[in-house]
């Protein structure tokens, strides 16, 4: 019976109307000839939010998204016709849905779209400095987008552009069957995962990709892909989905005789996010929806936040699980999954593992191999047939930090902000849902810092109509949250301290790390501020101790609904 299992009522529940009236949301309601505002790129330096949508790319001012520039990038009528001839929907499919939007260098972005089932990429000039105010498409230089953007707008691409090379997890064919992780652009030959081998990838849906250093030597850097895929037969009875983390070495250039132009360091492991059921059978949240990496002081060890939902049609639920990279690395250094025995089931591989261990990056740190092309044949052969790890990655504390079950919505997106409060640092989660609401949740340590309690601070409706939130970015500089959906883009501040009430008690009871009672109002808390009058208690929300100045006259209803 988890504390985080309680469907705790939000301290504040704000409707779209209330959000508008209190100036707590700014919305861009989309253009008549566009939709699908799903692909976000935040540029804090230029103070811009770039958004890829249907036939358009936008550049929004982070201060106020009402101020924006746009690039129109449709497909030619001929491409549109071909797409229509292929039996596709002229409005929902036969357009250029932007799926990749990444910083390419100091002056350009790289963008790819579905191109009406004919993926296409190009460069966008944004200038050297914010004041240049440049935002234009390089229409003289289009590139084939195959292996970069999917053909089908319903599919996602997980991508990462580093050192002029694009890593992307996507579908590389018209039918949406050839899913792969690619590396394209750059000076090297494109590299991909093994084709038509369900042991490597089994109808995956890619979520995100991240570069995480392995050591102080950049040669050891790895790219991690988060995705969900069908469980391989024998791994599970019946059709099931598994959440996955996959790794590849940044300096993987494929094999020499075998796995030529294919990854030689690809490994994947299952991510578990589950709660024990009353009958001893765990309830699994397997449908990975989104991932957020919270950087720590050590760049090698960010905390991974994952949003999951259940696969079941009967039982609808969502969960947030946290993972440590040290646990991930431990699994990748553990036993490989191997099929054996009379029922050909998955078992941990017990035989001799070739040297250097498959999945290790060629570098001075872990062994004497300069390139994956120099790897011995037995390493390549083993890597080809053993892409999966036997052990799964369990979440921190072996359980979700938050679950929601008896509600009519599911989680879709997550961003996390680390906030300095009076009594320490807190991670504040902003969780997007499939009904256009955002939950603001703080993780509060109970007896120990490991045992966390979730406090649901706010539930905000950010779009006029219920719509799935498909993108979220958080600007620490602007202290704003940006949200994308099919309908448009919304912007809201990370905190609304004044809404918590007019008394110290209410401010304290709110337990919002952003807010503190300053003697006369509930306002933004700054740890650097010298004022000793600041009253705040995130850990316990105890106004009696902290509001001894007679400011307890406000209502002390912990579940106060703001209407």
């Amino acid at each position: 019976n988890y504390a985080n299992g309680k469907n705790n009522v939000p301290r504040l529940k704000l409707s779209y109307k209330e959000m508008l009236e209190s100036n707590n949301v700014i919305t861009f309601n989309g253009l008549a000839n566009s939709s699908s505002y799903h692909t976000f790129l935040l540029d804090e330096e230029r103070s811009r939010l770039y958004v890829g949508a249907k036939d358009h790319i936008f550049s929004f001012n982070l201060v106020n998204i009402k101020d924006f520039q746009k690039i129109v990038w449709p497909v030619s009528y001929t491409r549109r016709d071909e797409c229509k001839w292929a039996g596709k929907d002229i409005l929902k499919e036969c357009a250029n849905f932007i799926k990749v939007l990444k910083a390419y260098n100091q002056t350009h972005l790289y963008a790819c779209g579905t191109g009406a089932f004919h993926p296409i990429c190009t460069y966008i000039e944004v200038g050297h400095h914010p004041e240049d105010n440049i935002f234009k498409l390089q229409d003289s230089h289009f590139e084939n987008g195959r292996g970069k953007s999917p053909y089908d707008p319903k599919l996602l691409t997980a991508s990462l552009l580093i050192d002029g090379e694009l890593y992307s997890g996507t579908a590389a064919d018209f039918m949406g069957r050839d899913f792969a992780i690619f590396r394209t652009l750059g000076h090297h030959h494109p590299i991909r995962t093994e084709q038509h081998d369900s042991r490597w990838l089994n109808d995956p849906r890619f979520i995100s990709a991240h570069l995480i250093p392995e050591s102080d030597n950049p040669e050891d850097d790895k790219v991690y892909f988060f995705f969900r895929e069908n469980a391989i037969d024998g791994e599970h009875s019946g059709k099931a989905t598994h959440a996955r983390i996959g790794q590849i070495c940044k300096n993987d250039f494929g094999g020499h005789r075998s796995l030529v132009n294919k990854w030689t360091t690809f490994l994947k492991a299952r991510l578990i996010c589950s709660v024990p059921g009353p009958n001893g059978i765990d309830t699994h949240f397997d449908e990975l929806q989104d991932v957020f990496l919270m950087n720590s002081k050590d760049p090698k060890n960010p905390i991974v936040y994952g949003v999951f939902t259940t696969s079941s049609n009967i039982f609808k639920g969502s969960a947030v699980c946290m993972y440590s990279m040290s646990d991930v690395r431990r699994v990748f250094l553990g036993p490989y999954a191997h099929r054996d025995g009379p029922n050909y089931q998955w078992v941990p591989y017990q035989g001799r593992v070739p040297y250097p261990r498959p999945g290790t990056c060629p570098s001075k740190t872990f062994g004497g191999f300069d390139s994956t092309k120099d790897l011995p044949d037995d390493v390549i052969t083993f890597a080809r047939s053993h892409p999966a790890m036997y052990n799964p990655v369990f979440p921190i504390n072996n359980r979700p930090i938050m679950i929601k079950t008896d509600v009519n919505y599911q989680f879709t997106q997550i961003v996390v902000d680390r906030v300095d409060a009076e009594d320490g640092q807190y991670d504040v989660m902003f969780i997007g849902t499939d009904v256009g609401t955002v939950l603001k949740v703080v993780s509060v340590p109970k007896e120990t810092w490991h045992d966390l309690e979730e406090v649901l601070l706010e539930e905000m409706t950010v779009f006029r109509e219920p719509t799935t939130i498909s993108a979220m970015e958080l600007s620490t500089k602007q202290q704003q949250l940006y949200i994308g959906s099919t309908a448009g883009v919304a912007q809201l501040p990370l905190h609304r301290c004044d809404i918590y009430g007019k008394a110290c008690a209410e401010c304290c009871l709110a337990r919002d790390p952003y807010c503190a009672w300053d003697g006369s109002s509930c306002s933004r808390y700054f740890p650097t501020a010298k004022a000793r009058t600041r009253a705040q208690d995130i850990r316990n929300g105890d106004p009696l101790t902290h509001c001894s100045d007679g400011g307890i006259e406000g209502r002390m209803d912990h579940h106060h609904h703001h209407h």
Partner: antibody, heavy 116, light 111 residues
Amino acid sequence: EVQLLESGGGLVQTGGSLRLSCAASGFTFSDYAMSWVRQAPGKGLEWVSWIYYDSGSKYYADSVKGRFTISRDNSKNTLYLQMNSLRAEDTAVYYCAKLNGDFDYWGQGTLVTVSS
Amino acid sequence: QSVLTQPPSASGTPGQRVTISCSGSSSNIGNNDVSWYQQLPGTAPKLLIYADSHRPSGVPDRFSGSKSGTSASLAISGLRSEDEADYYCGAWDSSLSGYVFGGGTKLTVLG
């Protein structure tokens, strides 16, 4: 200059097979869908089949479905039409055409005669 | 029997304006772009008009296309002897999932 050159036509018995080829040049072949259109002697044009630029999708007229197979080799800039179980009514000049929302370039055609 | 209906023949004298009609249905002309093709005797067809009314480069502006509802037409003004050819209309048919042509119109330039 866009050029399409068909080959492989000829005389064939009913029930026989034939493979037509179309060599393309003067444009980025791998970027365009391609099609076959035929014209029976003294008759009008009839669309036969088309193929997506990356072979991802193929479409056929009902009259040839199950007997004809369209394919392409983008590395060789060549389009193919494998014709099996040929009938007398398949006798026609077969044109290879570049698809660009319509048939914007045509080859000179190759004659296929099916005799009974 | 062609899905798109064209008159089998048309004629005119040099300098005259001639119009060729093409009628179809909502599944082809009504909801898809119409193209016109010219086939000179003994040669391959050539694209004359695309997207209802657009001319590819190199096609004289004497040729124009238009569309209304489920019918389209090709107009040739200032008729010349070299315009003597077969003219075909074409469009994608959504219900047949295929491209359809008209039966063709044989244009004769008299005199």
